[in-house]
């Protein structure tokens, strides 16, 4: 009986540790996509509707803030699209990029952790264009550090929650 109690206690401990593992999945807020044809920061994301969820991390001022030191897997998926019903592209040669950036408040500094994208030729003869970027990586993050997303040509962002999103989850503690 004692072994059983010990076992279930261990399970509970494991489960509560898992439940405390920080994670976030943030989806684009389509009502507030900034304008610009160069690199801009995307600051408006959902954290609590549809597929979006957050636990033991903080979302504030457009940035995902780390609350616990650890090794995290970071990911971002950005879709760009254009359909002729919305008008014409002013230029057919495009640089479609995403940058995942880490900012430290304690030692004021900013680093690009990941970038992805391509130059594209989106011909005016086509009715529809689409391009998707996915980046992901494993990073040591400290409490208080902030993760943000920058993109080029935000007016071409696909506003669906399954198209434009980013997130993080803690994989293990720092030894």
């Amino acid at each position: 009986e004692k072994a059983m109690v010990d076992g279930s206690w261990l399970d509970l401990a494991k489960r509560s540790k898992l439940e405390a593992q920080p994670f976030a999945h943030l989806t684009i807020n389509a009502t507030d996509i900034p304008s610009g044809s160069h690199k801009v920061s995307l600051s408006s994301w959902y954290h609590d509707r549809g597929w979006a969820k957050i636990s033991n991390m903080t979302f504030s001022n457009g940035k995902l803030i780390v609350n616990q030191d650890g090794f995290y897997y970071l990911y971002a998926n950005i879709c760009f699209r254009h359909h002729e019903t919305s008008g014409d592209l002013a230029t057919e040669y495009l640089q479609l990029m995403v940058y995942v950036t880490k900012t430290s408040i304690k030692i004021p500094s900013s680093h690009t952790l990941m970038k992805g994208g391509s130059t594209k030729y989106w011909s005016g003869n086509s009715e529809f264009h689409f391009y998707s970027i996915n980046v992901g990586g494993f990073f040591k993050l400290r409490s208080g550090e902030e993760i943000s997303i920058e993109v080029s040509n935000p007016s071409l962002l696909d506003p669906d929650q399954d198209a434009t999103y980013f997130g993080a989850f803690k994989v293990r503690d720092i030894d």
Partner: antibody, heavy 126, light 103 residues
Framework: QVQLVQSGAEVRKPGASVKVSCKAS????????IHWVRQAPGQRLEWMGW????????KFSQKFQGRITVTRDTAASTAYMELRSLRSEDTAVYYC???????????????????WGQGTLVTVSS | EIVMTQSPSSLSASVGDRVTITCRAS??????LNWYQLKPGKAPRLLIY???SLQSGVPSRFSGSGSGAEFTLTISSLQPEDIATYYC?????FGQGTKVEIK
Amino acid sequence: QVQLVQSGAEVRKPGASVKVSCKASGYDFSNYAIHWVRQAPGQRLEWMGWINAGNGNTKFSQKFQGRITVTRDTAASTAYMELRSLRSEDTAVYYCARDNSNMVRGIIIAYYFDYWGQGTLVTVSS
Amino acid sequence: EIVMTQSPSSLSASVGDRVTITCRASQSISRYLNWYQLKPGKAPRLLIYGASSLQSGVPSRFSGSGSGAEFTLTISSLQPEDIATYYCQHTRAFGQGTKVEIK
């Protein structure tokens, strides 16, 4: 305030060419596209083409392809539309119009014509 | 190529009347639809963009509605200065126009 001022009326013989100008003021000319639209007597408005005043990129209606040239002079904040091989059916009022999409804020020419020139009557007659 | 069809082609109404003009697209165009007012010898004027947004400086008696393929321009209380021809437009395509006259 934003203004587009077009050149005066023109009379041409069939087969000739005409060049209409559109001088912009009251905004940064290079940040917007200029469209050309015409209206023949008793007909609906007809889109002809646009020019991105910043980079000079152009797009034309299939109907006018090969006969139309649209250029701009950024120093003079002026767009020009030249139509060649004129025929009697080209008799119309020709308008320039500004697209309301600011190219600094995005790269989509949205076809919202927020300011128009006063129109230039081109008469093609033998 | 998308075709825009307006109805009626002309209408006659009294000052103060509510006037409605309809515009149909040959396929769905979301909300990418604009309305213009044309008076003889004057520059055309953008009234409504994006199906329902009122262009600045345009009187509030003008309103637009609709999405997909069917759209409406409404003048809530017709004024003498509203005598003109009205056109709907989606990108490169214009409707054939609706001429509004006073009875």
